[in-house]
């Protein structure tokens, strides 16, 4: 019996289409497969950022795969052909691995890249990113921000920079259509007549960096002799009510502080007849049903009631 062998795929490579980290891994069928013309071969693909302990593994019949990578580091990938047992009248046959790597040739020393990059998606409407210039760079250094997400034909440059002392230190983004729940890629590169500037790459999903507006229209309603219902409204904007968590701070008579986290726009507070003053503030955050992370809003304006009779039906400031 001759041992059945299969070659690895041809032309295995990583292609950078200029999407700032979203890369294509592609290959061609192996040579000498004509004995298995009727057989659908599969490919086992493994890939990772260099330095990562774990490989991502994909088994596919396709000749390409796409995924996002951190371009601050190199990428390594390997692939082999799998001949299923149906094709060989026995056990699965694997080829040797074909391997490839990809990295952006770094320019400049690491200290020249932007520092303290911070991006916030205000009220799920306005993206703003800010940074500090690299360490020891001269004033002639300028940074440029490029971004891409699936749906854009090509990477776009920021058109509305925030400046300080003539240097770009941030970017106000335009309206980003259909940009959430997908990876958002950013590259900040730089130029200087004095020395090369290291590029930085960032990837996040916009729904995870949302900072909502604070809640509005805070009110009190007496529910019973010992209960007061605190109510508020969701902030104006595109975020639906089901996406909010709230944190409340309640102060009774300048002493007792109650903190609570709730999922809807009400909170019932137990009170005593001795309560003379009640104040509360609320802030909002996108919850786990709509994002994996988020940023607390600023606190709302304080709503207080002061007086002798906390038994009135509705207490509005």
């Amino acid at each position: 019996d001759t041992e059945i062998k299969v070659n690895p795929p041809q032309d295995f490579e990583i292609v950078d289409p200029g999407y700032l980290g979203y890369l294509y891994l592609q290959w061609q069928p192996p040579l000498s497969l004509d004995h298995f013309k009727e057989c659908t071969v599969e490919y086992e693909l493994k890939y990772r950022n260099i330095g990562s302990e774990t490989w991502k593994t994909i088994i596919t019949k396709n000749l390409h795969y796409k995924d996002g990578f951190d371009l601050n580091k190199g990428i390594e990938a390997k692939i082999h052909t799998l001949l299923p047992w149906q094709c060989t009248n026995g056990s699965e046959v694997q080829s040797s691995w074909a391997e490839t790597t990809y990295w952006i040739s770094p320019q400049g020393i690491p200290e020249t890249k932007v520092q303290d990059m911070d991006c916030v998606y205000y009220n799920w409407q306005y993206l703003l990113c800010s940074w500090k210039p690299g360490i020891g760079v001269l004033l002639d250094t300028n940074y440029n921000l490029f971004y891409w997400y699936e749906g854009l034909d090509h990477a776009l440059q920021c058109v509305d920079y925030i400046k300080a002392d003539g240097q770009n230190i941030g970017c106000r983004f335009p309206y980003l259509e259909a940009s959430d729940y997908k990876d958002f890629y950013i590259c900040v590169n730089g130029s200087s007549e004095n020395k090369p500037i290291r590029s930085s790459y960032f990837t996040f999903q916009l729904q995870n960096i949302v900072k909502p507006l604070p809640p509005v229209y805070l009110t009190f309603t007496r529910e019973s002799s010992c209960e007061i219902k605190l109510k508020w409204s969701i902030p104006l904007g595109p975020i639906p009510a089901r996406c909010f968590d709230y944190e409340i701070e309640i102060r009774e008579d300048d002493t007792t502080l109650v903190t609570a986290t709730v999922e809807n726009e009400t909170y019932t507070l137990k009170t005593t007849n001795e309560t003379r003053q009640l104040c509360f503030v609320v802030r909002s955050k996108v919850n786990i049903y709509c994002s994996d992370d988020g940023i607390w809003s600023e606190w709302s304006d304080k709503q207080c009631w002061e007086g002798e009779d906390l038994s009135k039906k509705t207490l509005l400031r």
Epitope: N7, V15, Y24, P29
Partner: antibody, heavy 122, light 107 residues
Amino acid sequence: EVQLLESGGGLVQPGGSLRLSCAASGFTFYSYGMSWVRQAPGKGLEWVSYISGGGSYTYYADSVKGRFTISRDNSKNTLYLQMNSLRAEDTAVYYCARGSYSHYGAHYLDYWGQGTLVTVSS
Amino acid sequence: DIQMTQSPSSLSASVGDRVTITCRASQSISSYLNWYQQKPGKAPKLLIYAASSLQSGVPSRFSGSGSGTDFTLTISSLQPEDFATYYCQQALSSLPTFGQGTKLEIK
């Protein structure tokens, strides 16, 4: 519709250089390997060079190795052939062609440009 | 390098004839063989790939066969537009090579 349009040919002296370009349209350029094939006047076809879709793999005919360099700019959908140390025997029509593969690894040239004439003469 | 030899070098035939062109490889190339048609002043056109697969848009009167070292291109009923030069090309090696061509002329 797949289109390949070569340019850059012309008359050059022996020992001189020339850079051919091939502008591609109508397909996802980075997904395909590309080849240059030449045809001397009144002669048959001679394969010159191949480059994979991402540019990681390049191959050359022995007759041009060390003198010619194939490259591509996927952002511009353009294939190049840099020809140095040109000789009289490099005189030919140069075609760029798109490479495809059958599902079992058979490579073939399924679309060709109309060619550009390179004449090496003193 | 793998050498490809076509025969005949030239061939005269009439419209409606059945024509066969052969191509021999200097070593086994399995079924990694392609056929191209070229008309004067024009670019080559792919007819058959992988020895027997008909390229999309090519008339079914063209067919290819063979494996290993011996291959044939057959035109079942010659049409006026088929008078051209035909080339075989091996694709097993990373250095592809063409046959010298077969010129098909009107008798």
